[in-house]
Amino acid sequence: VQNSCDNCQPGTFCRKYNPVCKSCPPSTFSSIGGQPNCNICRVCAGYFRFKKFCSSTHNAECECIEGFHCLGPQCTRCEKDCRPGQELTKQGCKTCSLGTFNDQNGTGVCRPWTNCSLDGRSVLKTGTTEKDVVCGPPVVSFSPSTTISVTPEGGPGGHSLQVL
């Protein structure tokens, strides 16, 4: 014989000894009908705030208040946003490793410093965990076939460098 609890809709509960579908009481929910009890709604307060409110058919969803971010499945914890020089990992905020930086507050990942030499430039200022390196102007490199002659120009004392 089919139990009439099987016909209960989400938002209700049903006890087998009295198989009548009853609405979940306030502040409780059931996403599956026919369960013997409704679940207590999650509360979002303190460092949490509501992303979804609890209804008779679904639980509340929480997010973290501004300046904090979620950790764990379904945002079980709130942690202060990462500072510049850090990135968010599954274990929380971690300092950027040597040779990487993050200049953003609260978001972003650690990115490698710019490789100045790839553009034929020198490093003007070394990088930190919070700031990228600053590259200098292009380095003038001379090949062996280059001839340099200094010729007087524009009157006495005037010289110009000519690369031929």
């Epitope: 306030p26 502040s27 709604c41 307060a45 509501f50 992303k51 979804k52 409110f53 609890c54």
Partner: antibody
Framework: QVQLKEAGPGLVQPTQTLSLTCTVS????????VHWIRQPPGKGLEWMGI???????DYNSAIKSRLSISRDTSKSQVFLKINSLQTDDTAMYYC???????WGQGVMVTVSS | DIVLTQSPTTIAASPGEKVTITCRAS?????MYWYQQKSGASPKLWIY???KLASGVPNRFSGSGSGTSYSLAINTMETEDAATYYC?????????FGSGTKLEIK
């Protein structure tokens, strides 16, 4: 900064359908939900429903059968539709951000023949 | 649905006086939220998470309570506090408001 603005007809005939628009700025509809709340003249506040960040909705069971809330995320607009209007639907209609920290200025709707 | 009963419906207070508004819930709620509404204006979130003052709310206001009984208090009434105050629960939908308490200046 965060702003919400309601728009719609001031006067609607009984039995007709009311369509209101809430245009938001300063936040994204894909991050935050938007409520509709109404207030009949000289009376208290009544929560009508909400559309969430993911497009899901929750409604006030008392008017659920006549109510629908939808959105257009590209235009940052939320829509409220109430059908089979009655004179007691005459009210100031407000939209508000999910945390009720920002409200629109409201739009007055009169249902009368 | 959770029904919120506010009392008193109307109250008149003199400047400097202490004012208390209560809100009773038909079933237990985790936190209470309060709004201030002045004539012709939209409501403003006034107190959240039962006791936290919203941005810009003077600290003469306070909120307290738990379970089914909550209250909003004004330590020393000022003329600018004359308004209607509503309580609201967020524990489960439908989110419900109290019927409001009109606070007048004596």
């Amino acid at each position: 900064q965060v702003q919400l603005k309601e728009a719609g007809p001031g006067l609607v005939q009984p039995t007709q359908t009311l369509s209101l628009t809430c245009t938001v700025s300063g936040f994204s509809l894909t991050s935050d939900g938007v409520h509709w709340i109404r207030q009949p003249p000289g009376k208290g506040l009544e929560w009508m429903g909400i559309i969430y960040y993911d497009g899901g909705t929750d409604y006030n069971s008392a008017i659920k059968s006549r109510l629908s809330i939808s959105r257009d995320t590209s235009k940052s607009q939320v829509f409220l539709k109430i059908n089979s209007l009655q004179t007691d639907d005459t009210a100031m209609y407000y939209c508000a951000r999910i945390h009720f920290d920002y409200w629109g200025q409201g739009v007055m709707v009169t249902v009368s023949s | 649905d959770i029904v919120l009963t506010q009392s008193p419906t109307t109250i008149a207070a003199s400047p400097g006086e202490k004012v208390t508004i209560t809100c009773r819930a038909s079933s237990s709620v985790s936190y209470m939220y309060w709004y201030q509404q002045k004539s012709g204006a939209s409501p403003k979130l006034w107190i959240y998470d039962t006791s936290k003052l919203a941005s810009g709310v003077p600290n003469r206001f306070s909120g307290s309570g738990s379970g089914t009984s909550y209250s909003l208090a004004i330590n020393t009434m000022e003329t600018e506090d004359a308004a209607t105050y509503y309580c609201q629960q967020w524990s489960s939908t439908p989110l419900t408001f109290g019927s409001g308490t009109k606070l007048e200046i004596k």
